[in-house]
Structure formats: C-alpha cells, structure tokens
C-alpha cells in the first residue's frame, strides 16, 4: 500500500442523501397530487378504487413517533419499487383513454426511479439491511377493459399519494436521528 493520503470528498454524505430524498419525495408527491387531480377531472372516480397487488399503507399518524431508520427506509424502498412496477405496467397496459397522460406517467416513473436510487444509496452508505424488493404479490395481467385501466390508475395514484405523504413525514423525522 502507498503512503497514507486523504481521499477527496465524494458528492454527498448520508445526511445530504437524506435531504435529497426528502426533496425528491416532496417533488414526487406534488407530481402525484397533480396527476391524480388530472385523472379525476378527465375520468371522475365513482368512489374509492383499490388493486390487490398494491402494498398496504405502511404507516399511520399514530406510529410516526416510533419510527426506526432501517424499518422506514426498507419499507419505503419496497413499497416504492412496487409502485414503480405498477406505473410501468400502467404505461404498457393503458388503453387509448390513458395515452393522453403518457408524458406525465413517464415523468412520474423517471422520478420514482431517481428516488429509489437515492434511497438505496442512503441505505448503502448507512450499511442498513437491504431486502430484495419483491415482485407484486398478484401478477399484473392486462386490465379487463378500458374502464379497468382507468380504475387501476386511480388506485395506483391514490395509493402512491398516501405512501409519499407518510414518507415525507417519516424522512423528516428521521433527519433528526441521523
């Protein structure tokens, strides 16, 4: 080995990664809120929609105080990976009615991927356990009808909105513990 020499700082550190994850999550939440509103305008929803393959909401307001860094990041990454795959599926399977939202769905998918990269980098830098993201519990086949894909879009955007909402709160809380 050569003589002891310092290394230059790389682009970010774990606390900066967490700040970046908060900003990305907030930005993604705003995008999702806007897209969900567009969906409601174009295709009014008759009540709440859900998909069996979507993850259940990880946190409630009451559990925020007891959050632990590893659990939040692992769960958030696994859930967001599921939503990423669902958005991918929606873009592939969407009928002509949803094609008008393709640019927005594409941008949403790209931002989700960026957030997932950032979360994984944060987990690597902290050396936290990284569970392999599961495939969706229910295989995603083509929607039964055009209305089926619209209902699926409502469910995916609604679930993602709730997930990102608790993610912002959870990540902000974790900032104080790192």
């Amino acid at each position: 080995p050569g003589p002891p020499a310092g290394s230059p700082r790389v682009s970010s550190d774990p606390r900066a990664d967490l700040d970046s994850a908060v900003l990305l999550t907030r930005s993604l939440l705003a995008d999702t809120r806007q897209l969900a509103a567009q969906m409601r305008d174009k295709f009014p929803a008759d009540g709440d929609h859900n998909l069996d393959s979507l993850p259940t909401l990880a946190m409630s307001a009451g559990t925020l105080g007891s959050l632990q860094l590893p659990g939040v990041l692992t769960r958030l990454r696994v859930d967001l990976m599921s939503y990423f795959r669902h958005v991918q599926w929606l873009r592939r399977a969407a009928g002509p009615s949803l094609k008008t939202l393709e640019p927005e769905l594409g941008a949403l998918q790209a931002r989700l991927e960026r957030l997932l990269r950032r979360l994984q980098l944060l987990m690597s830098r902290l050396a936290l356990p990284q569970a392999a993201p599961d495939q969706p519990a229910v295989p995603l086949g083509p929607p039964a009808s055009a209305w089926g894909s619209i209902r699926a879009a409502h469910a995916i955007l609604g679930g993602l909105h709730l997930t990102l909402d608790w993610a912002v709160r959870g990540l902000l809380l974790l900032k104080t513990r790192l």
Partner: antibody, heavy 114, light 111 residues
Framework: EVQLLESGGGLVQPGGSLRLSCAAS????????MHWVRQAPGKGLEWVAV????????YYADSVKGRFTISRDNSKNTLYLQMNSLRAEDTAVYYC???????WGQGTLVTVSS | QSVLTQPPSASGTPGQRVTISCSGS?????????VHWYQQLPGTAPKLLIY???ERPSGVPDRFSGSKSGTSASLAISGLRSEDEADYYC???????????FGGGTKLTVL
C-alpha cells in the same frame, strides 16, 4: 479531507489473534456504515465485514464468520476488527472503508505464517 | 471464484474507448441493487470511480461512465490515457450474502 488510517497488522502464527483498528477523520464517522475489505497478495478485493452507522447491524463474509468480529466506537471515530483463529488464507492487506464504500484507507498487512 | 464476473484483462491504445463488463445474478445486480466501480492504481488503495450505476464522484473525469441493464453492468472509458492503466472492480449488494460482493477485477493495459 477524509482520512482512514489502519493499524494493528503484522505477522501472526496460525491459530493466533490480531486486532485491527481504523482511525477516521474528515467526515461524520457516526453517519457512515463501515467495512473491512481485504486483498490477498496479487489477488482481487474480498469483502470481509460491515457494520451499520450506529453499530446495530453487522454482517460477515462466510469465510470469516465465527472467527472475526467487527465493532465501532463512534465517540472515538474508530472502527475495529478482532480476528481470531487466524489461518494462512487470511494473509492479506486489510482495508478499512466507509459508506458505499466511498472512502478507503491505505491498508495494513496481516501475514499468517509459522 | 467471485460472485460478480469480470474479464481478467482488457486493453486499448491511447485515445481509444474501452468497455469492461460485470455480470451478476438475480441476488445482486438483477435485484435492482446499484453497481459501483473502483479503480486501483498499482500499489495503492482502491478509489471510488462510479457509484449508483452511472454517477461520478467529484473529481472523476467524464471520460468514465457506467451503465446497468438486467443482471449486467459495464464501465466505459473513452479517450484512453496511459494513467488509466490499473485494476478495475465492480461491486454490488448481494441479498443472499447480506453484504457487498466484488468482481474478480479487470487489469486494463494501455498499449
């Protein structure tokens, strides 16, 4: 500037023990997971062990499980590797590394030989 | 035997573009885990060259780039220089080992 300085290497007989230390400076040590990675003479890199930023998670390569113990003292900005039941095949330069790993020390040579 | 597979050697002439591959499996690169690349100059410690598949730490020239697809990744070096002669290693987290794994390394020779 980030500095990771390993110490504690040397010549030890098979079956013996050594404790490696790594003193860190220039970054927030307590915010980084820390690794030990080794490199046998003329060979490639082999990950040995990792400890999470707060010490709550520790993982080991199968080749050292049950013989090596990784630990850290965030108040002293120091990482440790306790190596017991050493074998000839443990002979290598041992690097301390932080993060992804983003930063690497210059390494300390451990020679296991009779 | 390394968990990630790299060609043992690669070569090119100054100014050329060379690519080094890194092949993994469903428990590491194929499981959506990021790939990182390290450069080890003769007699020195490894240095982070690319992280998160394609991001460069500050100070690394843009001649170095990374990409990932499926269970494989690659490092590309354009405008090859004599100072690029080194060993290059890929690394990724492996869920079955609960830790990072390295490729066997690729010795790059600038002819």
């Amino acid at each position: 500037e980030v500095q990771l300085l390993e110490s504690g290497g040397g010549l030890v007989q098979p079956g013996g023990s050594l404790r490696l230390s790594c003193a860190a400076s220039g970054f927030t040590f307590s915010s980084y997971g820390m690794h030990w990675v080794r490199q046998a003479p003329g060979k490639g890199l082999e990950w040995v062990a990792v400890i999470s930023y707060d010490g709550s998670y520790k993982y080991y390569a199968d080749s050292v499980k049950g013989r090596f113990t990784i630990s850290r003292d965030n108040s002293k900005n120091t990482l440790y590797l306790q190596m017991n039941s050493l074998r000839a095949e443990d002979t290598a330069v041992y690097y301390c590394a932080a993060g992804v790993p983003d930063y690497w020390g210059q390494g300390t040579l451990v020679t296991v030989s009779s | 035997q390394s968990v990630l597979t790299q060609p043992p050697s690669a070569s090119g002439t100054p100014g050329q573009r060379v690519t080094i591959s890194c092949s993994g499996s469903s428990s590491n690169i194929g499981s959506d885990y990021d790939v990182h690349w390290y450069q080890q100059l003769p007699g020195t410690a490894p240095k982070l060259l690319i992280y998160s598949n394609n991001e460069r730490p500050s100070g690394v020239p843009d001649r170095f780039s990374g990409s990932k697809s499926g269970t494989s990744a690659s490092l590309a070096i354009s405008g090859l220089r004599s100072e690029d002669e080194a060993d290059y290693y890929c690394a990724a987290w492996d869920s079955s080992l609960s830790g990072p794994v390295f490729g066997g390394g690729t010795k790059l020779t600038v002819l």
